[in-house]
């Protein structure tokens, strides 16, 4: 039975040109994490495999850094980076757990004035 839950940073905002950490945390299970995928709906950004280590997709190599931990750091953000990001935890024996983060990349001046994007 799958008892675990994924906690994520939820809906977050960052400013254009800056960086952001995408973070998920799996709790309430003793299952062993064998791999974590970081994905957008139609492309894979990175994989952290327990045996093989990190793999960053070539199209993101310049702007994505592994970590901290099982998280992912996005750098040199552009407005086009706005959207959904998914962490997919592969575990044994439970199976897969998934979490969602929505990132809004704001123009610098907007971000400076403390605006924050929230999905109701």
């Amino acid at each position: 039975m799958m008892t675990g839950t994924i906690e994520t940073t939820g809906n977050i905002s960052a400013e254009k040109g800056g960086s952001i950490i995408l973070q998920c945390h799996l709790s309430s299970t003793t299952a062993q994490v064998t791999q974590v995928n970081w994905e957008q709906q139609d492309q894979l950004l990175a994989i952290c495999n327990a045996d093989l280590g990190w793999h960053i997709s070539p199209s993101f190599k310049d702007r994505v850094a592994p970590g901290p931990g099982l998280g992912l750091t996005l750098q040199s953000l552009t407005v086009n980076d706005t959207g959904e990001y998914f962490c997919i935890y592969h575990t044994y024996p439970d199976g897969t757990y998934t979490g969602r983060i929505f990132l809004e990349v704001l123009e610098s001046s907007v971000a400076e004035h403390g605006a924050r994007f929230q999905i109701p």
Epitope: Q35, N37, E39, Q41, D42, Q43, L44, I47, N49, L52, H55, S57, P58, E84, F86, I88, H90, T96, T98, G99, R100
Partner: antibody, heavy 121, light 107 residues
């Protein structure tokens, strides 16, 4: 339990269009992406495209862009794939499929039974 | 597009055999490969995802391995009900692409 039930076989003339339906049940339709894949007689599998039924957002295989249109009707939990300007090479079994997880990777855990489309003059 | 190549279109086997079906990706796809089984007149059935993760309800005689560009599906104790076509698929990038399939036949 999760079920994807597709419409029946179709026979079409070259140049015509076909619209295949895929009715989903047993889960929250808007929460999971629906993919379309085809298989020509005796051949492998070919991915056509995907729809997010919640937002209506789509992504297509470049090969089918402009000819394939994928839509979803939330009120009936049904996804559709329309293919226009049919040619004989489009003769195939068309499948709808669903990813295994709500936000999961693009591996397909649930499949419709397939719809045979025959294009013949 | 990423090309998935299954070099053996047909493989002959016997009940009880250990069978290995291979698949090669045209570029590094890390561990983003799934395997499907398809019997005549049926829809494909998911066996393995992310190279080595067995899907729910799949018998443990089916094992996936590999990373990068080379992947293998192994059936450790071939059963008559395993006779089918087997396809690999990359779930690394769009468009999703499949191998041409490997058909298992009885010797």
């Amino acid at each position: 339990q999760v079920q994807l039930v597709q419409s029946g076989a179709e026979v079409k003339k070259p140049g015509a269009s076909v619209k295949v339906s895929c009715k989903a049940s047993g889960y929250a339709f808007t929460n999971y992406l629906i993919e379309w894949v085809r298989q020509a007689p005796g051949q492998g599998l070919e991915w056509i495209g995907v729809i997010n039924p919640g937002s209506g957002g789509t992504n297509y295989n470049e090969k089918f862009k402009g000819r394939a249109t994928i839509t979803a009707d939330k009120s009936t939990s049904t996804a559709y794939m329309e293919l226009s300007s049919l040619r004989s090479e489009d003769t195939a079994v068309y499948f709808c499929a669903r990813r295994g997880d709500k936000y999961g990777s693009a591996w397909f855990a649930y499949w419709g039974q397939g719809t045979t489309v025959t294009v013949s003059s | 597009d990423i090309v998935m190549t299954q070099s053996q279109r047909f493989m002959s086997t016997t009940v009880g055999d250990r069978v290995s079906i291979t698949c090669k990706a045209s570029q590094d796809v890390s561990t983003a490969v799934a395997w499907y089984q398809q019997k005549p007149g049926q829809s494909p059935k998911l066996l393995i995802y992310s190279a080595s993760n067995r899907y729910t309800g799949v018998p443990d005689r089916f094992t996936g391995s590999g990373s990068g560009t080379d992947f293998t599906l192994t059936i450790s104790n071939m059963q008559s009900e395993d006779l089918a076509d087997f396809f690999c698929q990359q779930h690394y990038s769009s468009p999703r692409t499949f191998g041409g399939g490997t058909k298992l036949e009885i010797k």
